[in-house]
């Protein structure tokens, strides 16, 4: 288990012709906030991905406005760190993507506007534990500058987090293989990944999996003394063959510790040491909040900045999964109307519509009008011999006979009302609370309460439903 | 804070179309339905129609759909109501709201129709 | 369309004593949504229509807590557990669920 962590030094125009215009003005004022993805390996992959290695958000950064005339110079930055814990071994390849995100202040009903400013995304080898590596990057006409360096957490050492640290068995020596842990020379290392539950005191490995014993001990896990000398903590009946007390199942046989937590014993029961982002007896809480970024794909993230609330992730449109880590197939829920033909361009769904049809689903039918009835309020549209029925809102189809509704998945939050049309669905928010989807509650001081992670779109757009 | 202000009082002559407006001031019409109401002398409240402006589609009550005509501008945070046809009867206070919840309503617009 | 009946249609009232006015649409207002939008108005003389309670129960803000709303489905209730000479004024129930909107015919509210 370890840490990445990325210091963000300076963002704004790059050298040469073309510089770009400041993101904010004296009308929209506005501040910069950070992502990182994470994810493992050289390959090249979609920015749509699963951040598998992680993610983080920065905090906000200070309130910027242009000064009229003068040249946009290198935006404030948020203080501090951005941090990407990882739970596994440090993968010493990796692939990232640095989003800068703008935040407009402007006085809008649906409360801040966020926008992507600039992607730069490269690939690295990086061991863990050692110096900063600097780089810069540029996103058209905008240049980042940034460090970043992998370390491991305690009590995790080496180039890939992947051997542990622990107190001496022994005053004078480490167990069999195992080497005296630099810098921390009262400890000794060994490998993270043994064998679930091996004995922390009487067993070790040198192999992923394995549990190898300490002189004395026997058993898969190590647990089991082998001669009357070695009865070094009964607790189990005696055992005729050996005249001493063989142990029963401790308490940490079997590891109860869920996701990579360290198990030890405690006089009534066990103790599970979790790692970063758990909590729990077992380790089985996702102690992760909004604040760690756990939202891929553009997700909004809802919840808690504290670590006993949970967080939910808003996915937006062709994302799925706890954590919108999954792309949706948009196109086998067959929205293309009248035998047209379904194209996802990732960014949007397009329908190719067979001759004699038309719209964004294909579902006008381009013939005349005359006799021809919109049912539900609908009314019929010509235009050159051909005609189509402009729907009422929550109705659809080519008579405007099918309800369509969307909000029957109650998209809005906190009370908010939700209309539907077929070019998407919008929420107006009860008072109290605005943005998209009414997640945020409006603060007595006008302020809003804003969400830990950078939404797709901005507050009050259509939101897509297929 | 977010405020409808609509257009003067109008004096119409029977037969001629009016043309009210309500302006969002201090935000934008967004995702709400702006209502139209109307209030004839001494009389309740009468739903018009309304529109969400980010969708530009409007609905109206089967009373007004033949004579009544909602429209939005979102680049000015504007919405208009056209009322044709008049008659003595469509004197009344013309209010705009913030729907579904009510919550903004604007000063009203006395349209009489007098010839 | 949903009508939406109202009684009283008048209700005088005495200072200090508690008011209830009963709104019933001619369906339910419950949206897929799951929210139901039934909003009550007040509408002092003179002024233009102010938004009391929304969604059945929750009370806007700035109003007074003697006003509270109840009710669900199709029948609905608003209180003023102590009427006060500020409150005189026309009551409606509206409710938002469905298009078109409608109005009940409003709730005269008088001092006895």
């Known amino acids: 288990a370890g840490v990445f962590e990325l210091q963000i030094h300076s963002f704004g125009p790059g050298p040469g012709p073309g510089a770009p215009r400041s993101p904010c003005s004296a009308r929209l004022p506005c501040r910069l906030f950070f992502r990182v993805c994470l994810k493992p390996g050289l390959s090249e992959e979609a920015a749509e991905s699963p951040c598998a290695l992680g993610a983080a958000l920065s905090a906000r950064g200070p309130v910027y406005t242009e000064q009229p005339g003068a040249p946009a110079p290198d935006l404030p930055l948020p203080d501090g760190l951005l941090q990407v814990p990882f739970r596994d071994a440090w993968p010493g390849t990796f692939s990232f993507i640095i989003e800068t995100w703008r935040e407009e202040l402007g006085d809008q009903i649906g409360g801040p506007a966020w926008s992507l400013l600039a992607r730069v995304a490269g690939r690295r080898r990086l061991a863990a534990g050692g110096p900063w590596a600097r780089d810069i990057q540029r996103a058209g006409a905008w240049e980042l500058r940034f460090s970043y360096r992998a370390r491991c957490e305690p009590p995790a050492v080496g180039t890939a987090c992947t051997r542990l640290c622990r107190p001496r068995s022994a005053p004078s020596r480490c167990g069999p293989g195992l080497r005296p842990c630099a810098p921390l020379e009262d400890e000794c290392e060994a490998p993270l990944v043994c064998r679930a539950g091996c004995s922390p005191e009487h067993g070790f490995c040198e192999q992923p999996g394995e549990c190898r014993c300490l002189e004395g001990w026997t058993g898969p896990l190590c647990t089991v003394p082998v001669s009357t000398s070695s009865c070094l903590s009964p607790r189990g009946p005696s055992s005729a063959t050996t005249g001493c007390l063989v142990p029963g199942p401790g308490p940490c046989d079997g590891n109860p510790c869920a996701n990579g937590g360290s198990c030890s014993e405690t006089p009534r029961s066990f103790e599970c040491t979790c790692p970063r982002g758990f909590y729990g007896l077992r380790c089985e809480v996702s102690g992760v909040t909004c604040a760690d970024g756990p939202c891929f794909n553009g997700g909004l993230c809802v919840g808690g900045a504290d670590p006993d609330s949970a967080y939910i992730c808003h996915c937006p449109p062709g994302f799925q999964g706890s954590n919108c880590e999954k792309r949706v197939d948009r196109c086998s829920l067959q929205p293309c109307r009248n035998g047209g033909l379904c194209l996802d361009l990732g960014h949007a769904l397009r329908c190719r519509c067979r001759a004699g049809f038309a719209g964004p689903r294909c579902e006008h039918d381009l013939d005349d009008c005359a006799g021809r009835a919109c049912a539900n309020g609908g009314t019929c549209v010509e235009g050159g011999g051909a005609h189509r029925c402009s729907c009422a809102l929550g109705f659809g189809g080519r008579d405007c006979r099918e309800r369509a509704d969307p909000c029957a998945a109650r998209p809005c939050a906190h009370g908010g009302r939700c209309y539907a049309h077929f070019s998407g669905l919008v929420c107006a928010c009860a008072p109290g609370y605005m943005g998209a989807r009414c997640e945020f509650p409006v603060h007595p001081d006008g302020a809003s309460a804003l969400p830990a992670a950078p939404p797709g779109l901005r507050p009050g757009d259509p939101q897509r439903y297929l | 804070q977010v405020q409808l202000v609509q257009s003067g009082a109008e004096v119409k002559k029977p037969g001629s179309s009016v043309k009210v407006s309500c302006k969002a001031s201090?935000?934008?019409?967004?995702?709400?339905?702006i209502s139209w109401v109307r209030q004839a002398p001494g009389q309740g409240l009468e739903w018009m129609g309304g529109i969400i402006p980010i969708f530009g589609t409007a609905n109206y009550a089967q009373k007004f759909q033949d004579r009544v005509t909602i429209t939005a501008d979102k680049s000015t945070n504007t919405a208009y109501m056209e009322l044709t046809s008049l008659t003595s009867e469509d004197t009344a206070v013309y209010y705009c709201a913030r729907d579904p919840f009510s919550d903004l309503w604007g000063r009203g617009t006395m349209v009489t129709v007098s010839s | 369309d949903i009508v939406m009946t109202q009684s009283p249609l008048s209700s005088p009232v005495t200072l200090g004593q508690p008011a209830s006015i009963s709104c019933r649409s001619s369906?339910?207002?419950?949206?897929?949504?799951?929210?139901?939008?039934l909003n009550w108005l007040q509408q002092r003389p003179g002024q233009p229509p102010r938004l009391l309670i929304y969604?059945?129960?929750n009370p806007f803000s700035g109003v007074p807590d003697r006003f509270s709303g109840s009710g669900a489905g199709t029948d609905f209730t608003l209180k003023i557990s102590r009427v006060e000479a500020e409150d005189v004024g026309v009551y409606y129930c509206?409710?938002?669920?469905?298009?078109?909107?409608?109005f009940g015919p409003g709730t005269k509210v008088e001092i006895k």
């Open positions: 369906q339910s207002l419950v949206h897929s949504d799951g929210n139901t939008y």
């Open positions: 969604q059945i129960s």
């Open positions: 201090g935000g934008t019409l967004s995702s709400y339905v």
């Open positions: 509206m409710q938002a669920t469905q298009f078109p909107h409608t």
